[in-house]
């Protein structure tokens, strides 16, 4: 950055190089150039010469004043006009930053995604600070009193192998930057209560042309958790409101759920699960589309899903299945 240049004098900022956004600040430049009594001192911000609010303090020093400084980052340097010199002489430069102290981290959440081998902790960091902000996640065993600390700039993955202090822990987050420090409330967790089962996936759908046509949704999960509660939500793509069906599931076989739907309408389905009686849900699965036929049977597979609806006996359409849900991160 600009701070790596060779200086012939120095530049400093008051109140500090990193300051609260919206403050009034002063940038001082003091020349120390051999055989030069500066005729004029110039300030540059991001390479552009500043014209106003410059005050000469003495023969070697000048001040640039900014009111209500709102830029997150700026590179400042100053130069001197020396007699008998064609060009301006560089004095020094400095990178300055403005931002905010961190908010109190809240909504601290720790989950173990099945098969991940990690406990993932996240939180709401609050408003953007604009400056480098670090988070220290404290994990304290309620059984051994031992505390571990993890430094991160966002969320943290903690190997479950490193959680040797039993099953019960307190977790809290400290946020710190150059402008301040805040600490979250403590979250008490039990490792057995925060496991989220392996993702549930809708694999295919078919509509059976009986007296009352019936749509069967096939869905599955790789979970080895025995008692799982799931929700499937569905709606016509033209509707705003979801219908929700609840299931107590064990995935010893592929699940089949029956729906009595209106003919010739495109529906969208999603599923999510949680370990029965526990706190956190999976995110909703990818959107799965199925159009009910007018009269003929219809099979829709997750592997195929373009909007190719032909008239004929059985129509199969196939999709990549990579459409994401409208609230993927809903784990609470």
């Amino acid at each position: 950055g600009i701070t790596n240049i060779n200086c012939s004098g120095h530049i400093w900022v008051e109140p500090a190089t990193i300051f609260k956004m919206g403050m009034n600040i002063s940038i001082y430049c003091q020349a120390a150039i051999k055989n030069c009594q500066p005729r004029k001192l110039h300030f540059y911000k991001n390479g552009i010469k500043e014209r106003f609010q410059i005050t000469r303090i003495n023969k070697t020093t000048a001040r640039l004043w900014y009111k209500n400084f709102l830029e997150p980052h700026a590179s400042m340097y100053c130069t001197a006009e020396c007699p008998k010199h064609f060009q301006e002489t560089l004095i020094c430069g400095k990178d300055i930053s403005s931002g905010y102290p961190p908010d109190i981290p809240d909504e601290v959440t720790c989950v173990i995604y099945e098969y991940s081998g990690n406990m993932t902790c996240t939180w709401n960091a609050g408003k953007l600070t604009y400056i480098d902000t670090k988070y220290v996640v404290h994990v304290k065993s309620l059984e051994t009193e031992e505390e571990q600390q993890y430094l991160t700039s966002s969320y943290i993955n903690i190997s479950t192998d490193s959680l040797q202090g039993g099953k019960k822990y307190l977790v809290w987050v400290q946020a710190a930057n150059a402008l301040g420090m805040e600490e979250s409330k403590q979250l008490q967790i039990h490792l057995d209560d925060i496991v989220i089962p392996s993702a549930a996936v809708i694999s295919r759908a078919e509509t059976i042309n009986a007296t009352v046509p019936k749509t069967i949704i096939y869905w599955d999960s790789q979970t080895t958790i025995e008692k799982v509660s799931c929700e499937m939500r569905y709606k016509a793509t033209t509707n705003q409101t979801w219908n929700v069906k609840e299931f107590d599931t064990n995935f010893t076989y592929v699940q089949q759920s029956e729906f009595y739907l209106e003919p010739n309408i495109k529906y969208v389905f999603q599923v999510r699960c949680q370990e029965t009686g526990k706190r956190y849900w999976q995110p909703w699965s990818s959107l799965f589309f199925h159009k009910t036929p007018e009269t003929v049977p219809q099979v829709t597979s997750k592997a195929f899903q373009h909007d190719t609806w032909n008239s004929g006996l059985t129509v199969a359409s196939i999709s990549t299945g990579h459409l994401t849900s409208d609230n993927r991160g809903d784990i609470g």
């Epitope: 991940s116 392996s198 694999s203 592929v254």
Partner: nanobody, 116 residues
Framework: EVPLVESGGGLVQSGGSLRLSCAAS????????MAWYRQAPGKQRDFVAA???????NYADSVKGRFSISRDNAKNTVYLQMNSLKPEDMGVYYC??????????WGQGTQVTVSS
């Protein structure tokens, strides 16, 4: 049906080690979970360990740190390395294969006996 063939069971002293293998006659991919369950006499079949096609693993609390599950996709085989065996680890160990959106398959089982 995809048969699963377990091997590697036997008699071992307390504190000893065994390595179980389970070979599937069909290939398996990232949508397949392979697992081991065990059944002690007069008890229900309990989950021991599982491994996904992408290498994610899961263990029962009672075996964490002692048992290790792995799979070799090229050989269509899953392994269970069992160290520091205890008498309570004794039972018939069953291999289990689950294909996402597809079949579930059990092996015939292999006996593990731990003598104190």
């Amino acid at each position: 049906e995809v048969p699963l063939v377990e091997s590697g069971g036997g008699l071992v002293q307390s504190g000893g080690s065994l390595r179980l293998s389970c070979a599937a006659s069909g290939s398996f991919d990232s949508d397949t979970v392979m697992a081991w369950y065990r059944q002690a006499p007069g008890k229900q079949r309990d989950f021991v360990a599982a491994v996904t096609g992408t290498g994610g693993t899961n263990y029962a609390d009672s075996v964490k740190g002692r048992f290790s599950i792995s799979r070799d996709n090229a050989k269509n085989t899953v392994y269970l390395q069992m160290n520091s065996l205890k008498p309570e680890d004794m039972g018939v160990y069953y291999c289990y294969m689950r294909i996402l959106g597809g079949g579930r398959y059990w092996g015939q089982g292999t006996q593990v006996t731990v003598s104190s």
